[in-house]
């Protein structure tokens, strides 16, 4: 089921899947002076079985000629819920994401693709949140958030991440000194997920991918 | 392994309160929304209401306003049931659970053993 | 409050034979989003309700497939191709589709 909400925002911080749930949908968006090709896919698909996920559809672009401006890809009324926009980012897997049941690897680009991704999430997908460069994250917990429902109502879970200015020392009361990268996360919050859900595949892979994924952005 | 394991049994005297646990372990709360449901002796199941451990959001059944509180603490991984104003009406076993999903399930996939409040005149 | 109605209250079988539970609405519980969250649970004597069928006809992981679920708008019904003595308690219906949300008055499943 689709999440009806953008995940939260984060004053001077973005967030990243690591691995799309099946049902996510990615919109064909083209760069200025370029439009979908007619009869091209509206939308890719995160689909699968048991053991493969992938993405269904390709995204084609192809030259407006004559018009010079962006072709809106404009979902069906039940799939307009969830127009999340993330900017473009290089496709860099730092680990197999294929590889995680139910879920598909970040689409690589294609030709002529929109600056920014509008991805339509569904329920159970897990982001994670980085500083941009210049901030430096003060955890009060896990830098995540899961888009969690109950009968229909969908809401994303807030990220206990603050992105404070490279030379603000101040601290929040209690609050232990931040560390250098943002990849710290509490031990007790990685051993307490024992969980057998999809959630607890994200959550420690994002312990481990955490540091590589968010420091190769920065190289 | 998922679990919920709920508090004892009660006790508790008839115009008294009592606070109910559920500690739930193999996952953390704040990543589910927490139901809690009556079952009277003998009788069939009614919800009491949810509540989202991250925020600390409720929505309660019209019937159970007023008569419960659900709150949740997520630093030991605990939701509770106040139940105030104490009457024979409210003598039942009190179930807590969660709203589980997947990629191809949800539904109340998780329940607590249940906790027998006696409320006795 | 939608109002979810059982029937039969109480349902003697013979071990083997098919079983047949309906459910029926007050009202129609297609949620606003198109999903119809209509739920069966089984609960043993002494036990905590599982869950058996989520969202109409879908099994829950674990549970045999002689259990099917079927219906919509305001009409549903919960069938077991062939009892087996694991299968006797209490069903319940539940519809989450509405604030609040309801049970069934439940349906006593048990041996002629």
């Known amino acids: 089921e689709l999440c009806d909400d953008d995940p939260p925002e984060i004053p001077h911080a973005t967030f990243k899947a690591m691995a799309y749930k099946e049902g996510t949908m990615l919109n064909c968006e083209c760069k200025r002076g370029f439009r979908r090709i007619k009869s091209g896919s509206l939308y890719m698909l995160c689909t699968g079985n048991s053991s493969h996920s992938s993405w269904d559809n390709q995204c084609q672009c192809t030259s407006s000629a004559t018009r010079n401006t962006t072709k809106q890809v404009t979902p069906q009324p039940e799939e307009q819920k969830e127009r999340k926009t993330t900017e473009m980012q290089s496709p860099m897997q730092p680990v197999d994401q294929a590889s995680l049941p139910g879920h598909c690897r970040e689409p690589p680009p294609w030709e002529n693709e929109a600056t920014e991704r509008i991805y339509h999430f569904v329920v159970g997908q897990m982001v994670y949140y980085q500083c941009v460069q210049g901030y430096r994250a003060l955890h009060r917990g896990p830098a995540e958030s899961v888009c969690k429902m109950t009968h229909g109502k969908t809401r994303w879970t807030q990220p206990q991440l603050i992105c404070t200015g490279e030379m603000e020392t101040s601290q929040f009361p209690g609050e232990e000194k931040p560390q250098a990268s943002p990849e710290g996360r509490p031990e007790s919050e990685t051993s307490c997920l024992v969980t057998t859900t999809d959630f607890q595949i994200q959550t420690e892979m994002a312990a481990t991918m955490e540091t590589s994924i968010f420091t190769t952005e920065y190289q | 392994e998922v679990r919920l394991q709920q508090s004892g049994a009660e006790l508790v005297r008839s115009g008294a309160s009592v606070k109910l646990s559920c500690t739930a372990s193999?996952?953390?709360?704040?990543?589910?929304?927490i139901h809690w449901v009556k079952q009277r002796p003998e009788q069939g199941l009614e919800w009491i209401g949810w509540i989202d451990p991250d925020n600390g959001e409720t929505e309660y059944a019209p019937k159970f306003q007023g008569k419960a509180t659900m709150t949740a603490d997520t630093s030991s991984n605990t939701a509770h049931l106040q139940l105030s104003s104490l009457t024979s009406e409210d003598t039942a076993v009190y179930y807590c659970?969660?709203?589980?999903?997947?990629?191809?399930?949800?539904?109340?996939?998780?329940w607590g053993q249940g906790t027998l409040v006696t409320v006795s005149s | 409050d939608v109002v979810m109605t059982q029937t039969p209250l109480s349902l003697p079988v013979n071990l083997g034979d098919q079983a047949s539970i309906s459910c029926r609405s007050s009202?129609?519980?297609?949620?606003?989003?198109?999903?119809?969250?209509l739920e069966w649970y089984l609960q043993k004597p002494g036990q905590s309700p599982k869950l058996l069928i989520y969202?109409?006809?879908n099994r829950f992981s674990g549970v045999p497939d002689r259990f099917s679920g079927s219906g919509s708008g305001t009409d549903f019904t919960l069938k077991i191709s062939r009892v087996e003595a694991e299968d006797l308690g209490i069903y319940y219906c539940?519809?989450?589709?509405?604030?609040?949300?309801?049970f069934g008055g439940g349906t006593k499943l048990e041996i002629k």
């Open positions: 659970t969660v709203f589980w999903y997947g990629n191809n399930y949800a539904g109340f996939a998780y």
């Open positions: 969202k109409v006809s």
């Open positions: 539940f519809q989450g589709s509405h604030v609040p949300p309801t």
């Open positions: 009202q129609s519980i297609v949620h606003s989003n198109g999903n119809t969250y």
């Open positions: 193999g996952f953390n709360i704040k990543d589910y929304y």
